[in-house]
């Protein structure tokens, strides 16, 4: 396969800042199915973090797919201020506080942070780099914001996101949420190029999901993560498919529409399934 | 106050097996994380296994991975090591430790006795 | 593996004198959150180890203050100011940074 012409990919100038799914489906790819029809859906977008348009073929695909561009922003977007700004309310934690610590299969182990439902803290454990599940953060504090109670036993403000009093909009914060890339399924395509724990310098390639492109990266020897692809070829083969995004002349952002097989998505989708 | 009681120690041949017990009682054992840390007769601490707090993950260095599993039983308040394809450098006493909120040992069992002899 | 060296490997100290047990480790114990997670534990004679410090300098409940820990990075010191005779034991250090985690071959403190 060819790298199909790199200069499809759009890059913004500003870095989103991290992203805290409402529901796991959120993060689905849209899948136009098998079917040939051609119906006008809508899909969440984890690269533009808004709701958007494509062409759905009838027939299977994923939950990541509205009939409305307002169920969508209902079910993936928090543009609802008063369930986002801390209430007087409970609030729930997110699915994910009450999973099992997993350091997944991997071996190259580093320090991360879980939610633990028995003692209702966030405790210290070890990740081996891989897979794993989303009650996993890089920091006690990040933990603590998603899923610890507050003190007066009301859930923090776990979504990080404060009413901007100049236009009313919702101005995400991020130091407050876990980032799109500790999804710890098989997308392993988004996440980062990690060299991992060695001393070794070997020549691999890593997706980088933010530019649609397979990049070079130096690899230790150990460790690191899935993302990692002894050839450009073979980066692109397993990632790129899908996962590009492109911007067509109406403003609209559409997916390629190949209906090669996509082991990606539907290990991706898979998982968090399984891990929800 | 926390108390963990192993068993199981024996004595047995290379290449045997030999399944070791920890009994937790004074704190809610479902809640930690917990591991197997053995000592050899020359005295030196050696890390074991490690399980999650409900049962389904397990940590091993590599000198007893695929030999030990690691497994627990929160109803119980029990936790197993399964020891096989054992070798005389796997003497040793063995302790069972509790993992505190810092992934740290905190408290140590009176320990067990596993001596691999022919 | 994460080498830990402790020195001396014997000790003997007069009671009511002070007393100094160093660890070092083969690489930086400071982890990527920030901790440093270098541990003590105490094995007095016919029993089995107790932990006395974690996180380098703090105490575990009932461990008197006469103990303390310092240090960073690779080099750790844990200090006993005026040595009592139920102190006598093996001192181990411990790090719970990096995987496995791994001991240190022991101080014996012995009373003079």
């Known amino acids: 396969d060819s790298e199909e012409d790199e200069e499809h990919t759009i890059i913004t100038d500003t870095e989103l800042p991290p992203l805290k799914l409402m529901h796991s489906f959120c993060a689905f790819k849209a899948d136009d199915g098998p079917c040939k029809a051609i119906m006008k859906r809508f899909f969440f977008n984890i690269f533009t973090r808004q709701c958007e348009e494509f062409i759905y073929g009838g027939c299977e695909g994923n939950q990541n797919r509205f009939e409305s561009l307002e169920e969508c922003k209902k079910m993936c977007t928090r543009d609802n201020a008063n369930r986002i700004i801390k209430t007087t309310l409970q609030q729930e934690k997110p699915d994910f506080c009450f999973l099992e610590e997993d350091p997944g299969i991997c071996r190259g182990y580093i320090t991360r942070y879980f939610y633990n439902n028995q003692t209702k803290q966030c405790e210290r454990f070890k990740y081996g780099g891989c897979l794993g599940n989303m009650n996993n953060f890089e920091t006690l504090e990040e933990c603590k914001n998603i899923c610890e109670d507050g003190p007066n036993g009301f859930q923090v403000d776990n979504y990080g996101t404060q009413l901007n009093a100049v236009n009313n909009s919702l101005t995400p914060q991020s130091t407050k949420v876990p980032s799109l890339f500790e999804f710890h399924g098989p997308s392993w395509c988004l996440t980062p190029a990690d060299r991992g724990l060695c001393r070794a310098n070997e020549n691999r390639f890593y997706y980088n999901s933010v530019i649609g492109k397979c990049r070079p990266f130096k690899y230790s020897g150990c460790g690191g993560n899935e993302n990692n692809f002894t050839s450009k070829q073979e980066c692109l083969r397993a990632c790129k498919k899908g996962f590009i995004q492109r911007i067509s002349k109406g403003g609209l952002i559409k997916t390629k529409r190949k209906r090669k097989k996509q082991r990606v998505k539907i290990a991706y989708e898979e998982i968090f399934v399984k891990n929800m | 106050e926390v108390h963990l009681v192993e068993s199981g120690g024996d004595l047995v041949k290379p290449g045997g097996s030999l399944k070791l017990s920890c009994a937790a009682s004074?704190?809610?054992?479902?809640?930690?994380?917990m591991s197997w840390v053995r000592q050899t007769p020359d005295k030196r601490l050696e890390w074991v296994a490690t399980?999650?707090?409900?049962?389904?993950?397990?940590y091993y260095p590599d000198s007893v991975k695929g030999r030990f599993t690691i497994s627990r039983d929160n109803a119980k308040n029990t936790l197993y090591l399964q020891m096989s394809s054992l070798k005389s450098e796997d003497t040793a006493m063995y302790y069972c430790a509790r993992q505190d909120g810092n992934f740290l040992m905190d408290y140590w069992g009176q320990g067990t006795t596993v001596t691999v002899s022919s | 593996d994460v080498v830990m060296t402790q020195t001396p490997l014997t000790l003997s100290v007069t009671i009511g004198q002070p007393a100094s047990i160093s660890c070092k480790s083969s690489q930086s114990l400071l982890d990527s959150d920030g901790k440093t997670y270098l541990n003590w534990l105490l094995q007095r004679p016919g029993q089995s180890p107790k932990r006395l410090i974690y996180?380098?300098?703090k105490l575990d409940s009932g461990v008197p203050d006469r103990f303390t820990g310092s240090g960073s990075g690779t080099d750790f010191t844990l200090k006993i100011s005026r040595v009592e005779a139920e102190d006598l034991g093996v001192y181990y250090c411990?790090?719970?940074?990096?995987?496995?985690?791994?001991f240190g071959s022991g101080t014996k403190l012995e009373i003079k």
């Open positions: 399980i999650t707090t409900g049962g389904s993950y397990t």
């Open positions: 996180l380098v300098s």
């Open positions: 411990w790090q719970g940074t990096h995987f496995p985690f791994t």
């Open positions: 004074g704190f809610t054992f479902s809640s930690y994380a």
